[in-house]
């Protein structure tokens, strides 16, 4: 199987985007890739959005999807926004070689992202 | 055990048209993925095409794309591979796949059923 690796840890910001690189080792020449973000929680896995692009080019999301992303050689920069507190969890990454021949799959590890809900502003006086 | 059994190939003229079908016993048919890979005589495995059952959204392989069809029937356990204006390059072992949870990668394959495309 391919090696994908992943940061352990990401901790969301206040306006509850979380951003991570994962890295891929291509055996191959890959021209068309795709990947998939899941969430595992409570051993349920679920996926979270999926992109496929050519090399070179941008990561093309479903238009109604919470991840942005681009591409620089075999890495990919993801950010998924929106999160909140209960969106906690392990994030996984998954890649895979499309084209040409043969097809590779990698899996990551995970990248555990925290998500704190901000504070409400309290009431002011003034 | 989940196994996956493959029919439907045969021989066609090009710019015929084939269905194949995956029928998969043993186990929970509510698999994240099942898709359709192919081999041709001194080639490498290659994907042909995949569908994923949370939105049961389809991905097609460019040199497929426009001819093949995948859907998946889950009253029947079943994921089919419609083949329409085949060409002598669509000449392979195709095998199904399937895989249990988006994490597991492609844990069952079937045995694979031949397409020959040829005049």
């Known amino acids: 199987a391919m090696h994908v690796a992943q940061p352990a840890v990401v901790l969301a910001n206040s306006r509850g985007t979380a951003s991570f690189v994962c890295e891929y080792a291509s055996p191959g020449k890959a021209t068309e890739v795709r990947v998939t973000v899941l969430r595992q929680a409570d051993s349920q896995v679920t996926e979270v959005c999926a992109a496929t692009y050519m090399m070179g080019n941008e990561l093309t999301f479903l238009d109604d999807s919470i991840c942005t992303g681009t591409s620089s050689g075999n890495q990919v920069n993801l950010t998924i926004q929106g999160l909140r507190a209960m969106d906690t969890g392990l994030y996984i990454c998954k890649v895979e070689l499309m084209y040409p021949p043969p097809y590779y799959m990698g899996i990551g590890n995970g990248t555990q992202i925290y998500v704190i809900d901000p504070e409400p502003c309290p009431d002011s006086d003034f | 055990e989940v196994q996956l059994v493959e029919s439907g190939g045969g021989v066609v003229q090009p710019g015929g048209s084939l269905r194949l079908s995956c029928a998969a016993s043993g186990g929970t048919f509510s698999f994240y993925g099942m898709g359709w890979f192919r081999q041709a005589p001194g080639k490498e495995r290659e994907f042909v095409a995949d569908?994923?059952?949370?939105?049961?959204?389809?991905y097609y392989a460019d040199s497929v794309k426009g001819r093949f069809t995948i859907s998946r029937d889950n009253s029947k356990n079943t994921v089919y591979l419609q083949m329409n204006s085949l060409r002598p390059e669509d000449t392979a072992l195709y095998y199904c796949?399937?895989?249990?949870?988006?994490?597991?990668?492609?844990?069952?394959w079937g045995q694979g059923t031949l397409v020959t495309v040829s005049s």
């Open positions: 569908i994923r059952t949370s939105a049961g959204r389809t």
């Open positions: 796949a399937a895989e249990p949870s988006g994490i597991s990668g492609w844990d069952y």
